[in-house]
C-alpha cells in the first residue's frame, strides 16, 4: 500500500505517525520475514519484528551490532598457558595426545599438527580463529592468513553427488562433466586440460607413512583427498629429469626415542635405514579454483597450515606426519 513517499511491501500497512508515515506489519505471517536473508552473523539468532527492518538479532558474545557484525574485544585476559607438566613431558614425542592438543600447548608441541606449532601464526584477526572451527561462518576468520575459517563461509558445502564414480574416474585423462565441480575436485582437471596451469607459489613437502610404491599406486586418491581439504587441485612435482618427486623416507626418531637410545642398546632388528614412508613434493594448480572461487591459495604457506589444522581436528584420511611449505625449488633431500 502507498504511504506518501514510503513504499510499503506486501502485507504491510501504512500508519501515519507523528514522525511521518511508517510501514507496519499487522501479522508477521503475511509479511516477508526480515530473517529470510539470515542477516544475523556469527551465530546470532534472528527474531522477526513488525517494523523495519523486520528482524532483530540476539548476538552471541563477543559480537554486537544490528547484525552481530561488530566484534567487541572482551576485557583483556592473559593468554592461556600450557600449565600441565603432563603436556610438557608429552610434547614433541611424535604422538598426538588429545589432552595437550590446544593452542596454549602448541598442539602438543606440533605432535597433533604435522609438526607445525602454530598454523595460525599469520592470522591477525582479533578472534582466536582456531577456536572458531564451528561449522558456521566467522567473517573475521575468513582470510587466507586465518585459513579461510576452515572453508566454513562457502555456504552449505555441497558434497560430491557421484562420489564413488568421481573418485574412480578422478584424473584419468577423460573429462566427466558430472564430476567437474569444486566438490568433486574438478575431475582432477580432466576437463581443463586445454587451459593453462595456474600454479601457486612454492611447494608442499609432505611426509606420509606409506612407502613410495604404495603412495604412487594410490596417488590419485591421495591427491583427491588433500585437494578436497584445500578446495583446489594438487599434483606431484617433477624434478629436472621429469621424474615424480616421491622419495623414500627413513624416519626421524623422535626426541623421546633418541633419549631412550642413549640409555639402552639398540634392540635386535632396529634398523636406522628402514623405509618408514615417503617424502612427497606437491604443487597446487589453481586453474579451476580461480574460476569458481575467491578462496584459492596464492602460495603454499597457508595450504600447509590448513593441512595442519585438519590434523589438529583429526580429519586427515592419510597418515601424514609432517607438512612444510618450501618457497624455493628444493634439492633432493631426505
Amino acid at each position: 500500500s502507498s504511504c506518501g513517499q514510503v513504499k510499503c511491501r506486501k502485507g504491510e500497512q501504512c500508519v501515519h505517525t507523528a514522525s511521518g508515515p511508517r510501514c507496519f506489519c499487522p501479522s508477521p505471517r503475511d509479511c516477508e520475514s526480515g530473517c529470510a536473508s539470515s542477516p544475523c552473523q556469527h551465530g546470532g539468532s534472528c527474531h522477526p519484528q513488525r517494523q523495519p527492518p523486520y528482524y532483530s538479532c540476539q548476538c552471541a558474545p563477543p559480537f554486537s551490532g544490528s547484525r552481530c557484525e561488530l566484534y567487541t574485544a572482551p576485557p583483556s585476559t592473559p593468554p592461556a598457558t600450557c600449565l600441565s607438566q603432563y603436556c610438557a613431558d608429552k610434547a614433541r614425542d611424535g604422538v598426538c595426545d588429545e589432552a595437550c592438543n590446544s593452542h596454549a600447548c602448541q598442539w602438543d608441541g606440533g605432535d597433533c599438527s604435522l609438526t607445525m606449532e602454530n598454523p595460525w601464526a599469520n592470522c591477525s584477526s582479533p578472534l582466536p580463529c582456531w577456536d572458531y572451527i564451528n561449522n558456521q561462518c566467522d567473517e573475521l576468520c575468513n582470510t587466507v592468513e586465518c585459513l579461510f575459517d576452515n572453508f566454513e563461509c562457502q555456504g552449505n558445502s555441497k558434497t560430491c553427488k557421484y562420489d564413488k564414480y568421481c573418485a574412480d574416474h578422478f584424473k584419468d585423462n577423460h573429462c566427466d562433466q558430472g564430476c567437474n565441480s569444486e566438490e568433486c575436485g574438478w575431475d582432477g582437471l580432466d576437463c581443463a586440460a586445454d587451459q593453462p596451469e595456474n600454479l601457486a607459489e612454492g611447494t608442499l613437502v609432505i611426509v606420509v607413512l606409506m612407502p613410495p610404491e604404495q603412495l604412487l599406486q594410490d596417488a590419485r586418491s591421495f591427491l583427491r583427498a588433500l585437494g578436497t581439504l584445500l578446495h583446489t587441485n594438487l599434483r606431484i612435482k617433477r624434478d629436472s629429469q621429469g621424474e615424480l618427486m616421491v622419495y623414500p623416507y627413513y624416519g626421524e626418531k623422535s626426541a623421546a626415542m633418541k633419549k631412550q637410545r642413549m640409555t639402552r642398546r639398540s634392540l635386535p632388528g632396529e634398523q636406522e635405514q628402514e623405509v618408514a614412508g615417503s617424502k612427497v613434493f606437491l604443487e597446487i594448480d589453481n586453474r579451476q579454483c580461480v574460476q569458481d572461487s575467491d578462496h584459492c591459495f596464492k602460495n603454499t604457506d597457508a595450504a600447509a597450515a590448513l593441512l595442519a589444522s585438519h590434523a589438529i581436528q583429526g580429519t586427515l584420511s592419510y597418515p601424514l606426519v609432517s607438512v612444510v611449505s618450501e618457497s624455493l625449488t628444493p634439492e633432493r633431500t631426505q
Epitope: 611424535g94 626415542m257 597418515p319
Partner: antibody, heavy 122, light 107 residues
Framework: EVQLVESGGGLVQPGGSLRLSCAAS????????MSWVRQAPGKGLEWVSY????????YYADSVKGRFTISADTSKNTAYLQMNSLRAEDTAVYYC???????????????WGQGTLVTVSA | DIQMTQSPSSLSASVGDRVTITCRAS??????LAWYQQKPGKAPKLLIY???TRESGVPSRFSGSGSGTDFTLTISSLQPEDFATYYC?????????FGQGTKVEIK
C-alpha cells in the same frame, strides 16, 4: 585381514621376567599405535602401555612404570612387552590392541589379539 | 588419573528389551569415549568410538550418546548374542582408563 597374535605368556615366579610378543599383519605396522591391555581373572580391563612404532614414543600406567618396557621391531611387524620384577598382582590375560588413529594415542582400540595368560605364582 | 564409573554393574534383561548402560567420567573428556563388548574367554570388541560413532560392522541397535562427563550406551532391542560384559573407556588422557564393566545377563 588385520590380525594381532600374542605369544610368550606362561607361569613365572614372583620377581621373575617374561617377554610377550604381538605379531601384527594386514596393515602398515609403523603407522598405528599399539597398546597392551590386561585383565586379571574375573576382573575388568586395565590399560598397561602404549607405543607408536614410527616415533618410538612410549607411555606406561603407573602400576608398571619402571618394571615393564614396551618396544617394537618394525622390520618384524612385532610389538613386545618386557616384564621384569613380576608380582602376583600382574597375573592376567594380556592383550595387544591396535589404536585406530595413526599417531593419535587419543584413539580407540579397533583390533585386538586373542590374549596370552601370564601367571605369577610361587 | 581420570576415573570412569559405570552403572549398573550388572543387569538382567530379556530378548527384545531396551537396555541402557551409563558411564560417568571424573572430569571432562569431551567425546573421547569408547564402548567395548566382551564375551567370556574372548578379546574385547570395539562397538562405539567418539562417544557415538558405530564401528563398521556393528549392528544399528547399538548406539552411544553423551559428551563431557556423562555417556550412555543403548541397545534398542536386545538380541541373544548381546549377552556379554560391556566396558566404557576414556582415551582423552593417558593413562586410558576403563569403567568396571556392566554384565548383561538373561532374565
Amino acid at each position: 585381514e588385520v590380525q594381532l597374535v600374542e605369544s610368550g605368556g606362561g607361569l613365572v615366579q614372583p620377581g621373575g621376567s617374561l617377554r610377550l610378543s604381538c605379531a601384527a599383519s594386514g596393515y602398515t605396522f609403523s603407522s598405528y599405535g599399539m597398546s597392551w591391555v590386561r585383565q586379571a581373572p574375573g576382573k575388568g580391563l586395565e590399560w598397561v602401555s602404549y607405543i607408536y612404532p614410527y616415533s618410538g614414543a612410549t607411555y606406561y600406567a603407573d602400576s608398571v612404570k619402571g618394571r615393564f618396557t614396551i618396544s617394537a621391531d618394525t622390520s618384524k611387524n612385532t610389538a613386545y612387552l618386557q616384564m621384569n620384577s613380576l608380582r602376583a598382582e600382574d597375573t592376567a590375560v594380556y592383550y595387544c590392541a591396535r589404536h585406530s588413529g595413526y599417531y593419535r594415542i587419543s584413539s580407540a582400540m579397533d583390533v585386538w589379539g586373542q590374549g596370552t595368560l601370564v601367571t605369577v605364582s610361587a | 588419573d581420570i576415573q570412569m564409573t559405570q552403572s549398573p554393574s550388572s543387569l538382567s534383561a530379556s530378548v527384545g528389551d531396551r537396555v541402557t548402560i551409563t558411564c560417568r567420567a571424573s572430569q571432562n573428556i569431551k567425546r573421547f569415549l569408547a564402548w567395548y563388548q566382551q564375551k567370556p574367554g574372548k578379546a574385547p570388541k570395539l562397538l562405539i568410538y567418539g562417544a557415538s560413532t558405530r564401528e563398521s560392522g556393528v549392528p544399528s541397535r547399538f548406539s552411544g550418546s553423551g559428551s563431557g562427563t556423562d555417556f550412555t550406551l543403548t541397545i534398542s532391542s536386545l538380541q541373544p548374542e548381546d549377552f556379554a560384559t560391556y566396558y566404557c573407556q576414556q582415551y582423552y588422557r593417558s593413562p586410558h582408563t576403563f569403567g568396571q564393566g556392566t554384565k548383561v545377563e538373561i532374565k
